[in-house]
């Protein structure tokens, strides 16, 4: 699908001073979706500060969010998601600033998780899987995975594979022998729905297999 | 109120470009997305392409590619719609059209008729 | 591309009596209760007018007479009592995937 800038570009706020971010999780609860909001600058005194979402809800014209800590939070099934909210930050009853914003544009999905890596003797290969919960999601279910390994030593030197499925290969003949890496994987929307990469995955760590000197292959872990 | 106010009509010659104005008004200009429409005489609607005021970011219809090109001015919240190498298929109306949601349109221009004839 | 198939071509209904305008896509274009169809009216002379989007959802202002349902393929439009002033050509539009496309029309005529 087109689209008209990167994922996950918003909007700039009025003010500076009180410029914010959001982001939607869509049946993050059963049926239930969520939107969180949070100023960019950790210095706002956000003491007397509400944020309210206005537009494209259901049976309601307006919510507030509920604060925790720094961050502003609402859970509800009212999204209409179609049409943009507007979502303001406010003082009493005046609106500091405000943004429109369309809920299927700033979609965090899920971090996936039970991430693992198999070695294959025979086929001389790592068979890394994971599972994402949008597997069963109604409205989320298109995610492109961004998998990420390095070799644990070298700290920012990350190769990452671009895929939609839930399984990849990687060729053992890529990878350094008796060599311990490190993986890890994310993913974002991809039909559709538009927004921002999840969290990683917990990291996950294998041992590549020495190099059978008779042979030049690498022995099994 | 919310208004999108089109340039008036224009007759081209083959092989010529035409530019065609949207300024919006009654609104927050970057607020949403601007799109254009055309309708050839008696026929239906057809997308042809749109802009995000905000980030100056752009959609085509893959059949319009080459053909049109989108720009958007914040200054005067004009949106801009640049026709080339004109033909007679091209006669027709073109519309913008402001986008109240993902994709649908809930404000449109009054429509400029654009007429290529040699 | 989707396409937009609507039917009939052109209705002629006597005034107070309700028009179904109908509207089948060549593939899905809801995902769950989400459903990117959307529905224009337009009068000679005049630009299109939005009156129903995400399928059921009336535009503000728009009278009530007008609804809109369906999901996945097909979709109708109704106008349940028709009026003099509804006499127009409707279309029907997809924005699930781009290119977004619109379907042929219905002309709408007093019997």
């Known amino acids: 699908e087109s689209g008209y800038a990167q994922n996950g570009d918003l909007e700039d706020a009025e003010l500076d001073d009180y410029s914010f971010s959001c982001y939607s999780q869509l049946e993050v609860n059963g049926s239930q979706h969520s939107l969180t909001c949070a100023f960019e600058d950790p210095d706002v005194n956000i003491t007397n500060l509400e944020f309210e979402i206005c537009g494209a809800l259901v049976e309601v014209k307006c919510l507030n969010f509920r604060k925790l800590q720094e961050i502003y939070f609402i859970e509800t099934k009212k999204f209409l998601l179609i049409g943009k909210s507007n979502i303001c930050v406010k003082v009493g009853e005046k609106s500091l600033t405000c943004k429109k914003i369309d809920l299927t544009t700033i979609v965090k999905p899920e971090a996936p998780f039970d991430l693992s890596v198999v070695y294959r003797e025979g086929a001389n290969d790592f068979v890394v899987t994971f599972n994402t919960s949008h597997l069963q999601k109604k409205y989320v279910k298109v995610l492109m995975h961004d998998v990420a390994y390095r070799q644990e030593k070298d700290e920012n030197k990350w190769t990452h594979v671009n895929l939609s499925s839930t399984k990849l290969t990687l060729l053992q003949r890529k990878l350094q022998p008796a060599a311990m890496y490190e993986i890890k994987v994310r993913s974002i929307p991809d039909h559709y729905f538009k927004g921002f990469w999840s969290e990683w995955s917990p990291s996950y760590y294998f041992r590549t297999p020495e190099i059978n000197n008779s042979s030049g292959e690498m022995d099994p872990i | 109120q919310v208004q999108l106010v089109q340039s008036g009509a224009e007759v081209k010659k083959p092989g010529a470009s035409v530019k065609v104005s949207c300024k919006a008004s009654g609104y927050r200009f970057t607020d949403y997305e601007l799109h254009w429409v055309r309708q050839a005489p008696g026929q239906g609607l057809e997308w042809m392409g749109g802009?995000?005021?905000?980030?100056?970011?752009?959609a085509y219809n893959q059949k319009f590619k080459g053909k049109v090109t989108l720009t958007s001015d914040r200054s005067t919240s004009t949106v801009y719609m640049e026709l080339s190498s004109l033909r007679s298929e091209d006669t027709a109306v073109y519309y913008c059209?402001?986008?109240?949601?993902?994709?649908?349109?809930?404000?449109w221009g009054q429509g400029t008729t654009v007429t290529v004839s040699s | 591309d989707i396409v937009l198939t609507q039917s009939p071509d052109s209705l002629a209904v006597s005034l107070g009596e309700r028009a179904t305008i109908n509207c089948r896509t060549s593939e899905s274009v809801s995902i769950h209760l989400l459903h990117l169809m959307h529905w224009y009216q337009q009068k000679p002379g005049q630009p299109p007018k939005l009156l129903i989007y995400?399928?059921?959802n009336l535009e503000s202002g728009v009278p009530d007479r007008f609804s809109g349902s369906g999901s996945e393929t097909d979709f109708t439009l109704t106008i349940s009592s028709l009026q003099a002033e509804d006499v127009a050509v409707y279309y029907c539009q997809q924005s699930i995937k781009d290119p977004y496309t619109f379907g042929g029309g219905t002309k709408v005529e007093i019997k």
């Open positions: 995400g399928a059921s």
């Open positions: 059209a402001r986008s109240g949601g993902r994709w649908y349109f809930d404000v």
């Open positions: 802009i995000d005021p905000k980030t100056g970011g752009t």
